[in-house]
């Protein structure tokens, strides 16, 4: 079938890199500057993405290949082949329509991307507190009463001062 | 193609202004989130200001709040930054660039941003 088909179709002889030019007998052309295929036997070059403003070229354009973009310093890559650049942010923040906001109290962010999470309730495990939570650290789930020897006391520190935090929204 | 293309850049002394415009074609403008982002010399990209479909929620960053303005005519497929008491810490490339179609809690990427516009800030 390949071969019968190869007979028929003369385009189906062009290698990536190169389309099957209807203007000129069906030969196969180089694809143009700037342009690519990434399989044998189209018709036309694709476009190369561009990499420019908020994206930065990890990988040129070849012949036979697209461009890859990541994301300037600042920004990282979201979607797809980094569809799209979002603003960092530090740990202990996240991001919101007005740029980047502390995490409220009660909640943490160890990341530089992503939402602000609630510290783990340690009293649902039946544990204490080991180690006080903040902006950009979880708490430290410690033993439970009852796993500590007798005479041993809790090693629950008191619950922090409030802190001012920012609401999202 | 998607494509915006900025102007209106210059060299301008401090506490004077200037007005940025970005021209957008190839996509339906109105429908989409803009933002303004800069890059100062030898400094990673910042977010400056973004403003909703409608022009009804804009956002800034703290350092240019109350001094810069973000707006949009829908109708001319066009976003400007009016920027006013420029500082030497100015001093950048700004970029506009588009936004979601809409914003959820996470995510506020861009998806394309033009060539740039110079802005530079003297004494």
């Known amino acids: 079938f390949e071969r019968t088909r190869s007979l028929q179709d003369p385009c189906s002889n062009c290698p990536a890199g190169t389309f099957c030019d209807n203007n000129r007998n069906q030969i196969c052309s180089p694809c143009p500057p700037n342009s690519f295929s990434s399989a044998g036997g189209q018709r036309t070059c694709d476009i190369c993405r561009q990499c420019k403003g908020v994206f930065r070229t990890r990988k040129e354009c070849s012949s036979t290949s697209n461009a890859e973009c990541d994301c300037t310093p600042g920004f990282h890559c979201l979607g797809a082949g980094c569809s799209m650049c979002e603003q960092d942010c530090k740990q202990g923040q996240e991001l919101t329509k007005k740029g980047c906001k502390d995490c409220c109290f009660g909640t943490f962010n160890d990341q530089k991307r992503g939402i602000c999470r609630p510290w783990t309730n340690c009293s649902l495990d039946g544990k204490s507190v080991l180690v006080n939570g903040t902006k950009e650290r979880d708490v430290v789930c410690g033993p439970s009463p009852a796993d500590l020897s007798p005479g041993a006391s809790s090693v629950t520190p008191p619950a922090p001062a409030r802190e001012p935090g920012h609401s999202p929204q | 193609e998607v494509q915006l293309v900025e102007s209106g850049g210059g060299l301008v002394q401090i506490g004077g202004s200037l007005r940025l415009s970005c021209v957008a074609s190839g996509f339906t403008f109105s429908k989409y989130w803009m933002i303004w982002v800069r890059q100062a010399p030898e400094k990673g990209l910042e977010w400056v200001a973004n403003i909703n479909q409608d022009g009804s929620e804009k956002y800034y960053v703290d350092s240019v709040e109350g001094r810069f303005t973000i707006s949009r005519d829908n109708a001319n497929n066009s976003l400007y930054l009016q920027m006013n008491s420029l500082r030497a810490e100015d001093t950048a490339v700004y970029y506009c660039?588009?936004?979601?179609?809409?914003?959820?809690?996470?995510?506020?990427?861009?998806?394309?941003s033009g060539q740039g516009t110079t802005v530079t800030v003297s004494s």
């Open positions: 660039a588009r936004g979601g179609d809409d914003y959820s809690h996470s995510h506020y990427g861009m998806d394309v």
